[in-house]
């Protein structure tokens, strides 16, 4: 049985908070990395200035069985207005370079930190 009543729904997370939480998760991944992240899996590199949230998800969603990035995948799914499935490349307009997940996470983190510093929460 599932109890659905009795709890007030928490308010929506403001975009600034959502972005900060994603940054914190990416920092956590990079700091706690010991063995090669996701066994050195390769993903498509993305253009970080063009619809990056969906593009990042479309790239990372193709990595399966990697618990270290599962939370990031979940968070990014909330950042994208359309549903993303493995093998979908609607936002990844250019697919010409593959990089390791660890490098992808570092690049994404650097860009998101820059956006946060500049107050670009949209």
């Amino acid at each position: 049985l599932t109890c659905l009543g009795g709890f007030a729904s928490p308010g929506p997370v403001p975009p600034s908070t959502a972005l900060r939480e994603l940054i914190e998760e990416l920092v956590n991944i990079t700091q706690n990395q010991k063995a090669p992240l996701c066994n050195g899996s390769m993903v498509w590199s993305i253009n970080l200035t063009a619809g990056m949230y969906c593009a990042a998800l479309e790239s990372l969603i193709n990595v399966s069985g990697c618990s270290a990035i599962e939370k990031t995948q979940r968070m990014l799914s909330g950042f994208c207005p359309h549903k993303v499935s493995a093998g979908q490349f609607s936002s990844l307009h250019v697919r010409d370079t593959k990089i390791e997940v660890a490098q992808f996470v570092k690049d994404l983190l650097l860009h998101l930190k820059k956006l946060f510093r500049e107050g670009q929460f949209n």
Partner: antibody, heavy 118, light 109 residues
Framework: EVQLVQSGAEVLKPGATVLISCKVS????????MHWVQQAPGKGLEWMGR????????KYAPKFHDRVTITADTSTDTAYMELSSLRSEDTAVYYC???????????WGQGTLVTVSS | QAVVTQEPSLTVSPGGTVTLTCRSS?????????ANWFQQKPGQAPRTLIY???NRAPGVPARFSGSLLGGKAALTLSGAQPEDEAEYYC?????????FGTGTKVTVL
């Protein structure tokens, strides 16, 4: 053919709760997010929220989050939007609309008029 | 919460060109706002014209185009037709929710 068919018009008193259904056909229900949009008479569009029918994950607009609940029943391919503590300003047409990258908001229900009046 | 502002009304001559804009109170509109543009006529559900900033929805005439212009999302109607007279709305995505614009009433006169 993709179709979104909504439940009929409702007349309710202030403080009541309305439940609107949106039955879909012509596509796999769990493949796309379903969004809900409000339009008061003579006014603009307001995004209320969305649901991933596959796992029930929702996002709500700040304006509605404490009064709206969006659910989905995959056994009947139906999405629901419940709005509680109704007030006169909730008198509006409510639309369900399917969202995907290649056709965001391309398919809409016919709209459900909710009138809140004492 | 962000406010998305559009011109209240614009008039264009038949065959003329008009540009509608969509401004975000939080700063420059970017491709990560996944701007959508809609056309709505009285008594009808909205119809998507542009998605993802500059992609034309299926069946939408080539006279409609979307872009980013001076930090705002823009919809340009080139070669206006009488049937283009309608209300136009933009919608911007803010990381975890959409906000619709205030709407622009376009008159073809």
């Amino acid at each position: 053919e993709v179709q979104l068919v909504q439940s009929g018009a409702e007349v309710l008193k202030p403080g009541a709760t309305v439940l609107i259904s949106c039955k879909v056909s012509g596509y796999t229900f769990t493949d796309y997010y379903m969004h809900w949009v409000q339009q008061a008479p003579g006014k603009g569009l307001e995004w209320m929220g969305r649901i991933d029918p596959e796992d029930g994950e929702t996002k709500y607009a700040p304006k509605f989050h404490d009064r709206v609940t969006i659910t989905a029943d995959t056994s009947t391919d139906t999405a629901y939007m419940e709005l509680s503590s109704l007030r006169s300003e909730d008198t509006a047409v409510y639309y369900c609309t399917r969202y995907d990258y290649y056709g965001p908001f391309a398919y809409w229900g016919q709209g459900t008029l909710v009138t809140v009046s004492s | 919460q962000a406010v998305v502002t559009q011109e209240p009304s614009l008039t264009v001559s038949p065959g003329g060109t008009v540009t509608l804009t969509c401004r975000s109170s939080t700063g420059a509109v970017t491709t990560s706002n996944y701007a959508n543009w809609f056309q709505q006529k009285p008594g009808q559900a909205p119809r998507t014209l542009i998605y993802g900033t500059n992609n034309r929805a299926p069946g939408v005439p080539a006279r409609f185009s979307g872009s980013l212009l001076g930090g705002k999302a823009a919809l340009t109607l080139s070669g206006a037709q009488p049937e283009d007279e309608a209300e136009y709305y933009c919608a911007l995505w803010y990381i975890n929710h959409f906000i619709f614009g205030t709407g622009t009433k376009v008159t073809v006169l």
